[in-house]
Interface confidence: medium
Amino acid sequence: KSSNEATNITPKHNMKAFLDELKAENIKKFLYNFTQIPHLAGTEQNFQLAKQIQSQWKEFGLDSVELAHYDVLLSYPNKTHPNYISIINEDGNEIFNTSLFEPPPPGYENVSDIVPPFSAFSPQGMPEGDLVYVNYARTEDFFKLERDMKINCSGKIVIARYGKVFRGNKVKNAQLAGAKGVILYSDPADYFAPGVKSYPDGWNLPGGGVQRGNILNLNGAGDPLTPGYPANEYAYRRGIAEAVGLPSIPVHPIGYYDAQKLLEKMGGSAPPDSSWRGSLKVPYNVGPGFTGNFSTQKVKMHIHSTNEVTRIYNVIGTLRGAVEPDRYVILGGHRDSWVFGGIDPQSGAAVVHEIVRSFGTLKKEGWRPRRTILFASWDAEEFGLLGSTEWAEENSRLLQERGVAYINADSSIEGNYTLRVDCTPLMYSLVHNLTKELKSPDEGFEGKSLYESWTKKSPSPEFSGMPRISKLGSGNDFEVFFQRLGIASGRARYTKNWETNKFSGYPLYHSVYETYELVEKFYDPMFKYHLTVAQVRGGMVFELANSIVLPFDCRDYAVVLRKYADKIYSISMKHPQEMKTYSVSFDSLFSAVKNFTEIASKFSERLQDFDKSNPIVLRMMNDQLMFLERAFIDPLGLPDRPFYRHVIYAPSSHNKYAGESFPGIYDALFDIESKVDPSKAWGEVKRQIYVAAFTVQAAAETLSEVA
């Protein structure tokens, strides 16, 4: 068979057939099935769900479905010794205690094994002291406190509101500031949208609701005890003192009812400006300590959680490719949840389930994709992306040689306003072309394309008539594939209107109130947004696995490289005198970007013209496209972050969720004016420019004619 025929594509067995097979009603049923009990990582319930998914994927028609298990470090509250925070008087008596659990939602009162709110991987401890309010505990918040307000957090317990940045960054910042404990809380300003009722009457966070979450700073390491290698049966494990990314001070989350009780007594300095005020009826004083009448009272934390090596299970399904079985397109999302996982992750897992069913249906009718598709149900994502990272560590040699693309499939919705896509620039054209072919589910856009409604509601800030596509950051299972291995990656979900809803994430994120009913009643009663997300994720996988020429456009990388070079150059230009003194030049970077642009343009011309019936030439051109993302990987990694190896993108050092471009240069320049040794600091800037320029040039050369 010629390569054109090999996938047996008849009019029935094409993208349309795949998309038409996806049904909203099935996604709804799967979501219900996945959300009736908690599926916390490391528990029997989540193991049983893994086996159920394995069985169903086999029924759907995949060639093989296996469980891949690992023994990783997890963290749980002590069942007999609950975590809480108290206000104590001068005699040490507890005059106020925070709640020990969230009031369960209606219909779930008798469900067992709901883990109470806790900060996963918090060390044990019972620190007591004065409170300091640190706003969102971002880098800039601590700069404001320490440099402008001259407030010292050393030896204090800090209270920070959730939002804006990953909670692990908040804890790291507090540790660096010398705090001896951290209290995290959800402020209504960030988690209560005006005009919407609290759950169960609406999708807002009630006062007793609390956000769970891990507080690690893993920087891509995976299991804290086995960085770089799989946590298998013969693994060598580090001692807990050498574990990667564990916090050193106790941390605990609370809701806004409890936060009110702590914050209403705060004294000391007034908030520096309105951006430090939330929506509670408290002064938002920074402290330290309580005001006059209460100045002898202190805050005490009681944290008794334990870290335990526990078995986790990934489900890995394979649909073998007919022509290029050694080329892998991966669709993966996690299965473990903090409690019921109504949105995170099961709205995503239900979509993956339906995508697998649709692919299976086509396979049963005699169709196969050109390339192999791997489907993954990851475990322990909530504990630091552990399942995906351990599997990728175990299979890294295969993945780096065979991995075409990774599409992530966590929560399908975080709102119901418009599409949100984060991906490698290589996938921009794929996403644009696909969404032009899909119908918009949005009201007012009947008969219009998804591309049209998306572009209208979320326009690109740079290119008119195009939608916004964001950089990949982290905080989800694509991390190891993209940031460590350099496999082209993307993610898509439905989101809120960020302009009108300023709260962080969705209000009930990681709370007990994230239920099936939350989705079915308030977010997507018809499951039309879930269906659209299934079409986008599934459509991307279909095209990546089935198109004869990989649907990657290297010219889009050239465009963003120029944009990112301009941006980092502008940041550096804020220090003209130092740039002169230390002879800092960006010429090499701009020259490399120019070369990349020219070579990418020539490669694209060759891609239009080559003989696609010649399987050797076809494979050669596809390999150049597949390996382009890989070419941006620096084997040495970023400074102090060896598992973040992508030179163009990394998670921000100040917010794991956000992506930063040219992160090596960015970090070298960050706060450079405060460095004690400017010569050394600017030397590092120059080194990072050199690394970036070399990498861009080297990547460009992978697109040159091979001989």
Epitope: Y569, S570, M573, K574, P576, Q577, M579, K580, S583, S585, F586, D587, S588, L589, F590, S591
Partner: antibody, heavy 123, light 107 residues
Framework: EVQLLESGGGLVQPGGSLRLSCAAS????????MSWVRQAPGKGLEWVSG????????YYADSVKGRFTISRDNSKNTLYLQMNSLRAEDTAVYYC????????????????WGQGTLVTVSS | DIQMTQSPSSLSASVGDRVTITCRAS??????VNWYQQKPGKAPKLLIY???TLQTGVPSRFSGSGSGTDFTLTISSLQPEDFATYYC?????????FGGGTKVEIK
């Protein structure tokens, strides 16, 4: 003494070519980006072209792109400007200038200038 | 490209006067502006780089200020040898274009 000395100017017909040279002395030539700047009679300064210290990157004004080529020989401490397809509007005094930087991203100004060489394009 | 608009194009002043010349960039250029002095038949001379730093050997009566898009060259007390044409130049990004020049003449 730090010095730049241009040569190669003269009268040339439209469509003709000229090669200007700039000999540098008194400083480490290979550590500085270099530029050519011209000034038409009675007019202001117009930047023409630049080259980084290593010679790895070159830059041109739109008005000369595709016609002029800047180059350097660091072993000879010499900067060149090859001018082809000359036009009447290229008539000017051409200055060679040292950039107080190793590259064009950014430069801290042109701190050493030659005395200039006159190029006249006329039939 | 970044355009540099210099004003005024000429001015008349007396010895001892305070003279101010302004330059506006078409987009923000941090502090990457240089000022040159040119006398008839001579090559330009760098006076100020990076908006406000005096080049070695330049008298302190010359000063520069500004950042972003608006920049100023000031001569605090005009001397006879200061009658010349002054040019601003941006070196934020290529092409490093010059302003149109300001001719300072004797009143």
């Amino acid at each position: 003494e730090v010095q730049l000395l241009e040569s190669g100017g003269g009268l040339v017909q439209p469509g003709g070519s000229l090669r200007l040279s700039c000999a540098a002395s008194g400083f480490t030539f290979s550590s500085h980006a270099m530029s050519w700047v011209r000034q038409a009679p009675g007019k202001g300064l117009e930047w023409v072209s630049g080259i980084t210290a290593s010679g790895g990157s070159t830059y041109y004004a739109d008005s000369v792109k595709g016609r002029f080529t800047i180059s350097r020989d660091n072993s000879k401490n010499t900067l060149y400007l090859q001018m082809n397809s000359l036009r009447a509007e290229d008539t000017a005094v051409y200055y060679c200038a040292r950039d107080d930087s190793s590259g064009y991203y950014p430069s801290y100004g042109m701190d050493v200038w030659g005395q200039g060489t006159l190029v006249t394009v006329s039939s | 490209d970044i355009q540099m608009t210099q004003s005024p194009s000429s001015l008349s002043a007396s010895v001892g006067d305070r003279v101010t010349i302004t330059c506006r960039a078409s987009q923000s250029i941090s502090t990457f502006v240089n000022w040159y002095q040119q006398k008839p038949g001579k090559a330009p001379k760098l006076l100020i780089y990076a908006a406000s730093t005096l080049q070695t050997g330049v008298p302190s009566r010359f000063s520069g200020s500004g950042s972003g898009t608006d920049f100023t060259l000031t001569i605090s007390s005009l001397q006879p040898e200061d009658f010349a044409t002054y040019y601003c130049q941006q070196t934020y990004s290529p092409p490093p274009d010059f302003g149109g020049g300001t001719k300072v003449e004797i009143k």
